[in-house]
Each structure stands twice: as structure tokens, then as C-alpha cells.
């Protein structure tokens, strides 16, 4: 009685259970009455990352420097190349097919999370008591200067974009 289902790492063809090819190898010939499955290693710059019955290996991803990409991890016969972005850039998608410049946080906003090769800068508005007066991909919101600790008084209130201005205490008081 021919099988209707096969074991793990096998596939059903012509009423027979054939072994799948291991990662890093492609299928040449299905198994037969006389032979095991015939598999061949993937070529240079090719890979297959699963037990498979593919007749062609996949090409390794190309990290195009014109798109701001560079190789993070070189591919093997069993794994694809992993691309990342040049310094100051990050991937536009999980697949990292192209890069864009890291976003800067405008004045009034500070960096909550510095960008990585795969994620953009995360900005947050400076809360009361903090400010940022620059456009930056690294600067956090800074706390207003504490005039009191310097034996000074606030002459000009701070905003989310400006620090407080301190001045000497009024001596007439």
C-alpha cells in the first residue's frame, strides 16, 4: 500500500517517501525504487536555509553600497547575507533593502532612543523643566539650569527650546 504521508524531513512523490535535501544543498533527482534522493551543494554566493526539495539555490542578498548598505554577516551555503546600513543611516524595512539618514530631533525635542542600523531615532518632546535648543540625532533633553544652586535667580523662564536665564539676586530686598 503506497504511503499517503511521510515522516519529518521527507516528501511524497510518485507514491514514495523521499528524503528532503539538507540545508545548503539543492535537489537534483527525486529518490527512486533504486536510489536515495540526489542532492548537490549550493554554489558560491548561493544558499538554502531549510530541509528542501528546491532544484535551485537562492542567491545571497547583495548589500548595495549605493543604497547605503554594507555586509553585517556574510552568507553561507545555509544562511543568507545580512545587510546593515552605514554609520548614520538605518534600514527602511526589516529586510533592509535600502537605507535612509537617521532622523534628527528638532529643537524642543530630545533623543529618547538613539538610532541603530535597523531602527530610526526616536524623539520625545522635552517636558517642563527640560529643553533642547539644537537639531540632533544624539542629544537628549537637558534639564534647565538650577539658578538656586548657584545662588542666582531666574531672570528669564525656560521653555522646551531654551534654558532659563539666571541673574544675580536683587540686593535691595
Amino acid at each position: 500500500e503506497p504511503p499517503t504521508a511521510c515522516r519529518e524531513k521527507q516528501y511524497l512523490i510518485n507514491s514514495q517517501c523521499c528524503s528532503l535535501c539538507q540545508p545548503g544543498q539543492k535537489l537534483v533527482s527525486d529518490c527512486t525504487e533504486f536510489t536515495e534522493t540526489e542532492c548537490l551543494p549550493c554554489g558560491e554566493s548561493e544558499f538554502l536555509d531549510t530541509w528542501n526539495r528546491e532544484t535551485h539555490c537562492h542567491q545571497h542578498k547583495y548589500c548595495d553600497p549605493n543604497l547605503g548598505l554594507r555586509v553585517q554577516q556574510k552568507g553561507t551555503s545555509e544562511t543568507d547575507t545580512i545587510c546593515t546600513c552605514e554609520e548614520g543611516w538605518h534600514c527602511t524595512s526589516e529586510a533592509c533593502e535600502s537605507c535612509v539618514l537617521h532622523r534628527s530631533c528638532s529643537p524642543g525635542f530630545g533623543v529618547k532612543q538613539i538610532a541603530t542600523g535597523v531602527s530610526d531615532t526616536i524623539c520625545e518632546p522635552c517636558p517642563v523643566g527640560f529643553f533642547s535648543n539644537v537639531s540632533s540625532a544624539f542629544e537628549k533633553c537637558h534639564p534647565w539650569t538650577s539658578c538656586e544652586t548657584k545662588d542666582l535667580v531666574v531672570q528669564q523662564a525656560g521653555t522646551n527650546k531654551t534654558d532659563v536665564v539666571c541673574g544675580p539676586q536683587d540686593r535691595l530686598r
Epitope: T32, F34, T35
Partner: antibody, heavy 113, light 112 residues
Framework: QVQLVESGGGLVKPGGSLRLSCAVS????????VYWIRQAPGKGLEWMGM???????DYSTSVKGRFTISKDNAKTSVYLQMSSLRAEDTAVYYC???????WGQGTLVTVSS | ELQLTQSPLSLPVTLGQPASISCRSS???????????LHWYLQRPGQSPRLLIY???NRFSGVPDRFSGSGSGTDFTLKISRVEAEDVGVYYC?????????FGGGTKLEIK
């Protein structure tokens, strides 16, 4: 449909050479393996060797070094190049596909002076 | 090189009676994948061989169910439950587990 047709047999002197061809149709030689078998007059079957789909070859100990199997995927033919032939190489030579029961009709090789 | 030894060399049988042919291997025919590549062929007079049984016990398409194969490791048997006139010829066992592939010497079945 699947077909294998041998040709190239004939009379050859001891020490001579001969190339047998196995023309196939109905399947691709890059996806299927083919082997050669011979049968001397009134004798049993003897496996000569095979050409795998991937291009590698295997041979029987009796012909290794004297016989060479090759293929031309484009011309859809498998070849058996025989050299240093001996009287005991006289036989009907068959090419066979390695699945199912697909045999050629056979070609007779006679090695005699 | 692996040897396949068939017995008997000659097998006279009465029509309608059973027949049995043995094939012994000089080493195990179980492959690393668990398959056993032991096959049986029939060569009728003047014809090329025809596959009867593959991988020990699987009847090839179109082969009557009076033919059956059994065995494991190094010991294998071909049985014909009721011999018919068309079963006359030479039976060969063959293995494709180990390279080089090999054939048994053959068993000639004839009608008594």
C-alpha cells in the same frame, strides 16, 4: 514517453576502443540518472556503472579505469567510452533509467580478432 | 565488492505449485536512511529483464500479486504462490544500496 535507444555496438579487435551512445527522450538527464548493464552471451547481468543526474559517475571494479561514462544534457545522450577491450567484454550492453523499468533495446559489442 | 548468492541455480516447478528463490548478500543491504535496496527481475527467454519487486517487497506496477518479496539485512526471498507458464525464465536479485551495484547469478525457473 520515456525512451532509451543504444547505438554504437559492433565488432572490435582486442585492445581496441568503442563508444556506445544512449539517446534518451521523454526526460531530462539533469534530473534523472542512467546506468549501463551488460549481458555476455548465455550469462547473467553485470552492472557497469552510472551517470548521476548531478554529473558524478560510479563504476564497477571490473571496468574502472578502462570504461568512462559521460553525458551531454543538451544532446540528451549518455555515452559509454570503452577502451583496452578484451574478449570477455563481448556482451549486449543496455542503458537503463534509475527509476521505474525503462530499458533500452540493447546493442551488441563483439571483441574478437 | 558485495556478492549476491542465489539458490537454487535451477528450479523445476509444476504449474500451479508455489516456488521460492533465495538471495543472500555478503553484507547488509540496509542503507543509512533505513531503506533496503534489494530488487528482483525476471528475464524471459529472448527478452530484456523486467522489474518484478523493488526494495525487498514492493511489487512493481503491473506485476501480478502471486509474486511477493520478503527479507531483511542479508537474507531475502522471492515467492511465487502459483507458478504459471509465463513465469518461465531466469530470475535475478539485484542490490543498489552499495556501489558498485551487483546482481545475483540467476535462478532458472522451468516447468516440470
Amino acid at each position: 514517453q520515456v525512451q532509451l535507444v543504444e547505438s554504437g555496438g559492433g565488432l572490435v579487435k582486442p585492445g581496441g576502443s568503442l563508444r556506445l551512445s544512449c539517446a534518451v527522450s521523454g526526460f531530462s538527464l539533469s534530473r534523472y540518472s542512467v546506468y549501463w548493464i551488460r549481458q555476455a552471451p548465455g550469462k547473467g547481468l553485470e552492472w557497469m556503472g552510472m551517470m548521476w543526474g548531478g554529473g558524478s559517475t560510479d563504476y564497477s571494479t571490473s571496468v574502472k579505469g578502462r570504461f568512462t561514462i559521460s553525458k551531454d544534457n543538451a544532446k540528451t545522450s549518455v555515452y559509454l567510452q570503452m577502451s583496452s577491450l578484451r574478449a570477455e567484454d563481448t556482451a549486449v550492453y543496455y542503458c537503463v533509467r534509475t527509476d521505474g523499468d525503462y530499458w533500452g533495446q540493447g546493442t551488441l559489442v563483439t571483441v574478437s580478432s | 565488492e558485495l556478492q549476491l548468492t542465489q539458490s537454487p541455480l535451477s528450479l523445476p516447478v509444476t504449474l500451479g505449485q508455489p516456488a521460492s528463490i533465495s538471495c543472500r548478500s555478503s553484507q547488509s543491504l540496509a542503507s543509512s536512511s533505513g531503506n533496503t535496496y534489494l530488487h528482483w527481475y525476471l528475464q524471459r527467454p529472448g527478452q530484456s529483464p523486467r522489474l518484478l519487486i523493488y526494495k525487498v517487497s514492493n511489487r512493481f506496477s503491473g506485476v501480478p500479486d502471486r509474486f511477493s518479496g520478503s527479507g531483511s539485512g542479508t537474507d531475502f526471498t522471492l515467492k511465487i504462490s502459483r507458478v504459471e507458464a509465463e513465469d518461465v525464465g531466469v530470475y535475478y536479485c539485484s542490490q543498489s544500496t552499495h556501489v558498485p551495484w551487483t546482481f545475483g547469478g540467476g535462478t532458472k525457473l522451468e516447468i516440470k
